[in-house]
Structures are given as C-alpha cells and as structure tokens.
C-alpha cells in the first residue's frame, strides 16, 4: 500500500534535480575561474540540506545559510542588472554585455534558475509529485524562500547606478508584488546606490508611447525617491535593435533612439 503523501497545488520537484544542480555547479565553476575553489558536492549537500526532511511550508532563510556560505561570490556592485517579468531579454543582454550581471549570472542564481524543489517532513525523499504553490499553499516554501533570500542579498550588494529591465507589454509595468517590487526595491541601500535606472522594454513594433509616464512607473519613482535614491527611466522601443547595438555599438544605425 503506497504511503499517504501530501498533495500540493504546485508542480513537483524538477526531474533529475540533484543531477541538474550538480552539473550546473560543475559547469559554472569551470567557466568562472574565481569560483574554481568551490566543491560542487558540498554545494549540493548544502542545497539538499536546506529542504530535505523539512516541512515544505516551514522553510526559513537560515536553512539556506550553508548554501549562501559555499556560494559566496562578490560581483561588481556597480554592474548589477535587475529585471521583472522579462528574464529572457535580461539574460540575452548580459550574455552580450559580459561585465553586467543578473542574479542568474551568479552561481547561486544559476544553480536554481527555472527549477522547482521540495521535500517532505521527516523523510529523506525529494517530492517529485507536487510542491507548495506560493498563493494556494504557503509562502514559506523552499523555492520562494530561496529566491526571496538571494534576491534580497543581491539587491543589498548593489551600488552606484543600478539598472532594472521592465516589461512594457504588461498591464503593470512595475508590479509591487513581483520579486523586484516587493524585495529588491526595498533592499537597495541609499548609502551606496545613487540611481535606479529603469529600462522599459516595448513589445509592439509600432509602439511609440512614452511608457516612462506609465502610472506604475511613477509609483516606482515615488518609492525610490522616498528612499533617497535618484530615479531615471528610458524607453527601449526596439529590443531587437537594442541587443544588436549592444553587440555592435559602432554600427551607424545605433546613434538614433532605440
């Protein structure tokens, strides 16, 4: 008789999760010389230890302390790119502009990007059937706590001019409930961060509106200004051209507005 198992509302742990984390760690440390000292088996053990045998609605930031230790990585604080609801373009940008970093360009972010994981209380099993959904089940689940923790610390590390890429095609270009709106914005340090510069990415080919005037962008400006950080905003009307011009800045067509 199969043992009763808690049914959660969200998808289960990504298949081959242990192998994926380990393989990603090995790949990352091979590509990034400054992280060659990292012992990937220990990283996996620390990752596993954060959620295995624990109730998946009772995970805390401190459960990830061993992983935060082993994944410690100093990024240039003035080269940080945050994003909200436009991850793919943000990652395409940092793949070209190699001196800038999204969270997923760090070891900790790279390990967990697009993965789901959870365990079960008092058993060493990984739950591949279902994991808690943030809204329907609980917010203190392994995935949500991980991203809240690393996002907070990543934002805290930022300095000088911080850039954020926002999706101009969404009804809420700035969403207070996103990780950027609820965590990162509030953890930028006014003593270190001079300016938050938003890049609003347009979706439609013929969209010439100034989305920097959008009410949600004004809301973001208000939040940031109250924190004694300056705010600036740029429309990126043609994201394809924008990326092309990052690749080839001397191209003659790249002097006009993009």
């Amino acid at each position: 008789v199969p043992r009763w198992r808690q049914q959660w509302s969200g998808p289960g742990t990504t298949k081959r999760f242990p192998e994926t984390v380990l393989a990603r760690c090995v790949k990352y440390t091979e590509i990034h010389p400054e992280m060659r000292h990292v012992d990937c088996q220990s990283v996996w053990d620390a990752f596993k230890g954060a959620f295995i045998s624990k109730h998946p609605c009772n995970i805390t930031e401190e459960d990830y302390q061993p992983l935060m230790k082993l994944g410690t990585q100093t990024v240039p604080c003035n080269k940080i790119l945050l994003w909200s609801r436009i991850k793919d373009l943000a990652h395409q940008f940092t793949q070209v502009q190699r001196d800038m970093f999204t969270l997923e360009d760090t070891l900790l972010g790279y390990l967990a990007d697009d993965l789901t994981w959870c365990g079960e209380f008092n058993t060493s099993k990984i739950n591949y059937q279902s994991c808690p959904d943030w809204r329907k089940d609980c917010s203190n689940n392994p995935v949500s706590v991980f991203w809240k923790t690393v996002s907070r610390r990543f934002a805290e590390a930022a300095c000088d001019v911080v850039h954020v890429m926002l999706n101009g095609s969404r009804s809420k270009i700035f969403d207070k409930n996103s990780t950027f709106g609820s965590v990162e914005v509030h953890n930028l340090q006014p003593e270190k961060v001079q300016t938050l510069e938003a890049w609003v990415i347009h979706g439609g080919r013929e969209d010439s509106r100034d989305l920097c005037q959008d009410p949600t962008i004004k809301e973001l400006e208000s939040i940031i200004s109250k924190r004694n950080i300056q705010f600036s905003c740029k429309n990126i009307y043609r994201p394809d051209k924008f990326l092309q011009c990052v690749k080839n800045p001397e191209d003659s067509s790249c002097t006009s507005e993009i």
Epitope: T60, E62, D63, Q65, P66, M68, K69, G71, T72, Q73, T74, V75, T106, L108, T149, V150, R153, F154, E156, A157, Q189, E191, K192
Partner: antibody, heavy 122, light 111 residues
Amino acid sequence: EVQLLESGGGLVQPGGSLRLSCAASGFTFNNYDMTWVRQAPGKGLEWVAVISYDGSDKDYADSVKGRFTISRDNSKNTLYLQMNSLRAEDTAVYYCARVYYYGFSGPSMDVWGQGTLVTVSS
Amino acid sequence: QSVLTQPPSASGTPGQRVTISCSGSNSNIGSNTVNWYQQLPGTAPKLLIYSDSNRPSGVPDRFSGSKSGTSASLAISGLRSEDEADYYCQSYDSSLSGSRVFGGGTKLTVL
C-alpha cells in the same frame, strides 16, 4: 529570542587547561558557522577560531594554533573551545559569536554572547 | 599591532556628526567587505554595519558605513550620549592564515 551563553571561564595557572562552552538557543544551530573572539583587559577584539556549520572545517589565529581546539556538538546546540598550555597573554574575556553569510559579500558576526572571563595567573 | 588601523579616540558633542576611519590594504579592505561593531561599556560587541554599508534591523539610520579603496569609515550623525562606546572595524585578509582581522578600536566620547 536568539541567544548565546558562554560558560567555563575562571582562574587557571600558566600551562593549565580550560574548556569553554557556548550554549545556543533561538536559532537552528547546525546551519551556522560559529567563532570565538577574545578581548584582553582594556584592549581590542582579537579573533581566535572559527568552525564550519557541520564541524568539518576549522581555522585558528596564529597566536593560539596548536594550543586551542574549537569543536561543536550540533545535537546539544553547543560550541566549545578547549584551551591547553595557557599563557598569561591568553587572559581575556572570551566571546562566542554566530557567523552570518550574505551570499554576495563577506560574512559578519551577527550575534554575540555576553562573554566569559579567563584569567591565567600563578 | 592591528592589521586594520583606527584612530584610538574620537569625540563630538550631542547633535554633531562624527566619522571614524579604518585603514587597511589591498589584501583586506581593498578586496573584502567591512563590518563595524559597537561595544557599549561593560557589554558584548554588537553588529552595527555589515557588508560595508548595510544596517541590521534595529540599528538607527544615524549610523552609516562607506568604503573607498583600502579605507572604510563609519559616520554617526545626530550624536547622542548613548553612542559613547568603542567601535571596531573588521574585515578579512587574504594574505593571512586565519584571515579574520579587526581594527584596534576607537573610543568615542560624547562631550
């Protein structure tokens, strides 16, 4: 409430031994590296030793290497410092502290005990 | 002799702004983050600033940290009598075994 409570200090003769304990409560002890820091009377802080969350890694200040041993018992939520071959210059208040990692910057010692006084004198 | 150099003393009157410096080298402050600790008379040290300039919850925003090159500084604005304490900077030194290093401490007197 997160708390660290040191004990085991006292008066000991040069060449003698002492074992300090640090009882942790209010947090998941086995998730954190722990450290000992000392302060000689009227002087500044001096780092002594650190141990990893699982006890596998240890590191010592040159001034105590070979004489002091840091250890922990995660089942008892307790940190230890075994001090052998004590010298007059080891006289200090010994503090245990929790090490907190931030992921994208160096760690800090974010929680401290109240300290226990060790006096080495004949 | 401490690896990180702090002035032994500093003073100010209530309401004033005072700054405490912490000088190091490329192998410590130049390549690692700095933490600051406050030690009130007769008590244990307390974390005041971590990662150069971040305040733990509960620390008033009168305290601020900054870093430039191989030096760090702690600024206290709107000085109060209860700020009278010893202040220590701390970093990591990649050239040393047992790499955790403290400054010698600065005794702040509120006149």
